[in-house]
């Protein structure tokens, strides 16, 4: 057979689906690898072929499209399971070809089991809600294309094991779940179960997402440098270790990059010929506000180092701030026998 452009195993598309539920999987060739869509390919006389390799096997085999009730079928560039079974887990390949052209890609499909509270090994999308911010909604994800718009499914929302109904600040509204006002107590896993009829059968789609309540943009402020500050003086003798912490508080801001850095005499520490190390630690509050601490450390400080300017800088989407540390050389305490005696005019 002629050469085939093999895009290998597309592990970026780690597809997970629930056991005993419908699943529609689009051939990734048209989404990520080729510059044309299925309709164009079909019009050009190209054929889409599907096959698979079972879990823990090496043998590629054709997909059986003659199962009872068309359990597995293909429609255009979509592979359908109505429904999935646990042993459908494996690597699936879609190949587009004619007599002169061939391109294929494989992707892993994992059929997972869920428990009575919708826990499973499935990776969950995270939806962030702002704390005490007014009405916000989450939408039941990835249900498009499963049933026509003429079909009116029933949607039930759960938090963990429990159905959400008549609750004062969380209201199920069909495909949406509205949070009239979000609190920390609303953190958790929310599941929508979509039930729809098809050809005399009833199917269920289960979709779970994690809600994380985060700091509101209403309360967001520019970075706040807690240390260094005007109340602390770093007084050292040459040869001692100099440790200066830079501690910065960042309000939560969606998609903001928080940065902290030191300058020494206006330059990056790497550009200064001294042995300096910087260690960073990060902690988060319950609403994902962030505190970053960068400790600047010079093991054996010289009198030259004690004359330098040490400035902590911080930046977020809300602004940039800087604060200099007060560093001094310790004045040695006078030795009584010589200095004080001389001072008192002793001969």
């Amino acid at each position: 057979s002629e050469r085939c452009d093999d895009w290998g195993l597309d592990t970026m598309r780690q597809i997970q689906v629930f056991e005993d539920e419908p699943a529609r999987i689009k051939c990734p060739l048209f989404e990520h690898f080729l510059k044309f869509n299925y309709s164009t390919a079909h019009s050009a006389g190209l054929t889409l072929i599907w096959y698979w390799t079972r879990q823990d096997r090496d043998l590629e085999e054709p997909i059986n499209f003659r199962l009872p009730e068309n359990r597995i079928s293909k429609e255009k560039d979509v592979l359908w399971f109505r429904p999935t079974l646990l042993n459908d887990t494996g690597n699936y390949t879609c190949m587009l070809r004619n007599t002169t052209y061939c391109s294929k890609v494989a992707f892993p499909l994992e059929v997972v089991q869920k428990d009575s509270c919708f826990n499973s090994p499935m990776k969950l999308p995270v939806h962030k809600l702002y704390i005490e911010y007014g009405i916000q909604r989450i939408t039941c994800p990835n249900v498009d294309g499963y049933f026509p718009s003429s079909v009116k499914p029933t949607i039930t929302w759960y938090m963990g094991c429990y159905k959400i109904q008549n609750f004062n600040n969380v209201i199920p509204e069909g495909m949406n779940l509205s949070f009239l006002i979000a609190f920390i107590s609303n953190n958790g896993n929310y599941t929508c179960v979509v039930t729809y009829p098809e050809n005399g059968r009833t199917f269920h789609l289960t979709r779970t997402l994690t809600v994380k309540v985060v700091g509101s943009p209403k309360n967001a402020v520019p970075p706040v440098i807690h240390s260094p500050n005007d109340h602390v003086v770093y007084e050292k003798e040459p040869g001692e270790e100099l440790l200066i912490p830079c501690t910065v508080y960042f309000s939560f801001l969606m998609d903001s990059r928080n940065e902290v850095w030191w300058t020494i005499d206006g330059k990056k520490p790497d550009d200064i010929p001294i042995d300096v190390t910087i260690n960073e630690s990060i902690s988060h509050s319950r609403t994902e506000d962030e505190t970053r601490t960068q400790i600047l450390s010079i093991k054996k400080v010289t009198s030259e180092d004690l004359k330098r300017s040490y400035v902590c800088h911080a930046r977020s989407a809300k602004g940039e701030v800087a604060k200099a540390a007060t560093v001094k050389q310790k004045v040695p305490a006078p030795r009584y026998t010589v200095e004080l005696a001389c001072g008192f005019g002793a001969t």
Partner: antibody, heavy 119, light 107 residues
Amino acid sequence: QVQLVQSGAEVKKPGSSVKVSCKASGGTFSSYAISWVRQAPGQGLEWMGGISAIFGTANYAQKFQGRVTITADESTSTAYMELSSLRSEDTAVYYCARHLHNGIHLDYWGQGTLVTVSS
Amino acid sequence: EIVLTQSPATLSLSPGERATLSCRASQSVSNFLAWYQQKPGQAPRLLIYGASNRATGIPARFSGSGSGTDFTLTISSLEPEDFAVYYCQQGKHWPWTFGQGTKVEIK
């Protein structure tokens, strides 16, 4: 330290109802759910149902549906289990137990409440 | 509902010996299974969740294994305080159900 403290033992007549309380302390009540499990003398454990402390919605075992009502009062961090139309075979120790909203294992248990149904 | 069958009903062993308790489900429960210990006059105590994860404060001598329909609780070396009744519980399907228990008694 999480603690679930249940109400005291009860003696009831057949056909009557009993309401057992379970007060939680040492954790955020609204972050958890409370299940009720019973154990007849010398027998095993039987899950009756559970309630979400934040949403106040309950799940019940089919066997007890219509006869058991589980409620929660967030203001007092207390869950309640009411069993009606009592019969002698309902004589058992009734336990409340805590679990996460999406948890299927019961990590903290109350001390148990003995309910005796006798004419 | 899912029926959990524990075996043996009673296990007679001496301190220091290894105990192996079995729990079999009437259909697959994946790894959605927990084990509890109950001593006379006390409430049950969670030992293992997710078939193999030890709960907080549970000694390392307790371990769980299995997936699907067959599960095992192993106590590597019995201590005097381990003599009790052990229950398995599934959470794969409603209603949650328990096994009938295995009593571990001193020989």
